[in-house]
Interface confidence: medium
């Protein structure tokens, strides 16, 4: 992946920078929990999970069992927000690359194990057709190691 | 990867003072910058923003329509421009660099030494 | 609202620092330490992704309005002031900070 700067559309990385992309975030990490859960299993052990709640017993967090709330109303809402802020990328199948890769980059410090990242990186792709926009043709996803802060 | 803040010096209530934050080590365009303020003896208050091309400006409610931030990405330099300056804007200012593009989502990971700012008659 | 506004601690201590909001800003929420005379630095942000560098006995944990930053054995280099960061939403407000002051 080239960096921002050799790639000449300044236009696109400024429509970027006004794009909120937090809920497509929000509403991917909420459907690869939910996706984790109905296969009967903890992806983590607490001591891995960087969206546990408080370890401490006596503090429980009022957003368990999971801090994205895993009941539908909040992911449909993320995932409307989402929707709206992609469908400004829908003219600019390039720019929608370079969304889908910064949303990647993001979270990418955030995903635990291959496995996990790699249904991120699905669901991800698959982000664009969900909303009923068309995806890019070719995008690449993978993100070097040192994430954000390779640059 | 560094920044450095320049410009911090006696300013006049009411009057205008211009701070600079040269930045190396990184590609500039990649990031926003952030300045950050701290009055004597108290905590930080988050001033204003930019984003990487600087397409995007936010600021606190505080220096809204007194201050302005600017950047030159040829140069690797934002600038914070302090007009009708007040008793209150005292403080050491921070120039701090953002993990994105987009402002502040994810934390400041490299801050300047600070500039100093004294309004007084 | 960040609490305490300081605290007294020894070497070796379990230290807690809370960060309380009016309102939900989901995991956009970072931790700085501030020694005196210097710049702050960025400890964990999202909430709960410590920052390359940091040691590990520091944590933070929480969601939505209530956040946590632990440091699970305080060393003699952590005495300074701590600040959350909301990251929610413009302004980007700082806690008032918490100061940890050797007993």
């Known amino acids: 992946r080239q960096q921002w700067e050799l790639q000449g559309d300044r236009r696109c990385q400024s429509q970027l920078e006004r794009a909120n992309l937090r809920p497509c975030e929000q509403h991917l990490m909420q459907k690869i929990q939910r996706d984790e859960d109905s296969y009967g299993r903890d992806p983590y052990s607490p001591s891995q999970d960087p969206y546990s709640p408080s370890q401490d017993p006596d503090r429980r967090d009022p957003y368990s069992p999971s801090p994205y709330d895993r009941r539908g109303a909040g992911s449909s809402q993320h995932q409307e927000r989402c929707c709206n802020e992609l469908n400004e990328f829908e003219n600019n199948q390039r720019c929608m690359c370079e969304a889908l890769q910064q949303i990647m980059e993001n979270q990418s410090d955030r995903l635990q194990g291959r496995q996990q990242e790699q249904q991120f990186k699905r669901e991800l792709r698959n982000l664009p057709q969900q909303c009923g926009l068309r995806a890019p043709q070719r995008c690449d996803l993978e993100v070097e190691s040192g994430g954000r802060d390779r640059y | 990867v560094q920044l450095v803040e320049s410009g911090g010096t006696l300013g006049q209530p009411g009057g205008s003072l211009r701070l600079s934050c040269t930045a190396s080590g990184f590609t500039f365009n990649r990031f926003a910058i952030n300045w950050v303020r701290q009055a004597p003896g108290k905590g930080l208050e988050w001033v204003a923003a930019i984003s990487g091309t600087g397409a995007v400006t936010y600021y606190a409610d505080s220096v809204e329509g007194r201050f302005s931030i600017s950047r030159e990405n040829s140069n690797n330099t934002v600038f914070l421009e302090m007009n009708n300056l007040r008793g209150e804007d005292t403080a050491v200012y921070f120039c701090?660099?953002?993990?994105?593009?987009?402002?502040?989502?994810?934390?400041?990971?490299?801050w300047g030494q600070g500039t100093t700012v004294t309004v007084s008659s | 609202t960040q609490s305490p506004s300081s605290l007294s601690a020894s070497v070796g201590d379990r230290v807690i620092i809370t960060c309380r909001g009016s309102?939900?800003?989901?995991?956009?929420l970072n931790w700085y330490q501030q020694k005196p005379g210097k710049a702050p630095r960025l400890l964990i942000s999202a909430a709960s992704s410590l920052q390359g560098g940091v040691p590990s006995r520091f944590s933070g944990s929480g969601y939505g309005t209530d956040f946590t930053l632990t440091i699970s054995s305080l060393q003699p280099e952590d005495f300074a002031t701590y600040y959350c960061?909301?990251?929610?939403?413009?302004?980007?407000?700082f806690g008032q900070g918490t100061k940890v002051e050797i007993k």
């Open positions: 701090a660099k953002d993990r994105t593009p987009v402002t502040n989502y994810y934390g400041m990971d490299v």
């Open positions: 960061q909301q990251t929610s939403s413009t302004p980007y407000t």
């Open positions: 309102q939900t800003i989901d995991n956009y």
